[in-house]
Amino acid sequence: PGPPAGSPRVSSDPRADLDSAVLLTRSLLADTRQLAAQMRDKFPADGDHNLDSLPTLAMSAGTLGSLQLPGVLTRLRVDLMSYFRHVQWLRRAAGPSLKTLEPELGALQARLERLLRRLQLLMSRLALPQAAPDQPAVPLGPPASAWGSIRAAHAILGGLHLTLDWAVRGLLLLKTRL
C-alpha cells in the first residue's frame, strides 16, 4: 500500500496567524487613535494622564532589533489582556459623560478580544510558553469622580495607542524571523 492519506490544510498556519495579528493590531491602532482624538475633542486633556494599574510600555525603538518571538508575544498578550480589563472596567465604571462613547468602547473591547485570541492561537501553533491569559488582575476601584473616569479614559487610550504602535513594529519584525 502507498503512504497514508494526508490531512487537508486547516484554515491558517503560523505565518498566516502572524499576518492576521498584524492586520488586527493595525486596525485596532487606528480605532484607538480615532477614539483618543474623540476623547480629546469632547474632554480636552490637561497634560498627560497616568494610571498606576496600567502596564509599563514594553519596548522602545532601541530594543526593537533584539526582539525574540516568545518574549514579544508573551509580553504583548499580557499587556493587551490588562488593557482589555481596563476597557471593560471603564465601560462599567464610566459616568454619564463617557456613556456617549459606549459603542466605540464596546467595539474596541471586541477587537481587543479578537486580537488576544489570534495571539493565543499563534502561540499554541508555535508551541511557545503561554502566559495564562486570565492572571489575577490588579483590582480596579470605581473612579473618584466623573472627571476621574475621564482622566482614566485618556490614560487607557494613550497607553493602548503606544502599546499597539510598538506591537505593529515588533510583529512586522518577527515576520522576517518565522
Epitope: 494526508g6 490531512s7 486547516v10 492561537l121 501553533r125 508555535l126 508551541a127
Partner: antibody, heavy 114, light 112 residues
Amino acid sequence: EVQLLESGGGLVQPGGSLRLSCAASGFTFSSYGMHWVRQAPGKGLEWVSVISYDGSYKYYADSVKGRFTISRDNSKNTLYLQMNSLRAEDTAVYYCAAGVPDYWGQGTLVTVSS
Amino acid sequence: QSVLTQPPSASGTPGQRVTISCTGSSSNIGAGYDVHWYQQLPGTAPKLLIYSNNERPSGVPDRFSGSKSGTSASLAISGLRSEDEADYYCAAWDDSLNGPVFGGGTKLTVLG
C-alpha cells in the same frame, strides 16, 4: 496535502529503548510546534511531549519526564522521540502532531512486553 | 483520570442535534485558554474538528459548532448522520503541564 509519517515503533522489552521518527511534508515544518500524543489500546488520547517551532522549548507529561526526549531537525523536516526505560504502561499508538495540534500522523504502535 | 471531563457516551438518531460537554479547571479552560475538538473515526487518527472554541477548519461541515463559557465548553452536532459515529475529544492548553490536556473522550452512537 499535509503528511506526517511516523516510524520506529515495535516490540521492546521493559527497560528497553526505542527512537520514534516523524517525517513531515506538505507544510512549513519549521513554523510549527510539534507534539507526540499517545493512545493506549481502547483508551483515550494522552499528550506526551511538545517542542517549539525552533526547538528552544520542550515540555513533557509527568508520566514520561526523565525517560523520554523530544527533538527535531528542521533541515530534515523530522521530529524525534527518544524513549528510554520503557514500561508496560507505555504501550500505545504514538501519534506525531503539528500545531494546535492541527495535523496528525497515522501513528506507530509501541508494545512494551517481556 | 483525564484533566478535562467529558461524558463517556452520547447518542442520537439521524437528523437530531446532540451536544457533548467538556469541563475543565482554573489551570486550563478557566484560565482563558481556547478549546479545540477532535473527531476520531474507528481505526483512524484524530482529526481537528473545531479550533479556538468555535472556528471550523476548511472542509468541516457547518453542522459542527463549538462554544465556551467559564470553565466549560461544548460541541454541538446538528443534523446527525451515521458517518458522525466516532469518538470526540476536547483539548485545551494547561498551565500546570505547559502542554495541552485532553478530555477522556465521548463515544457518539448514531441510533437506527
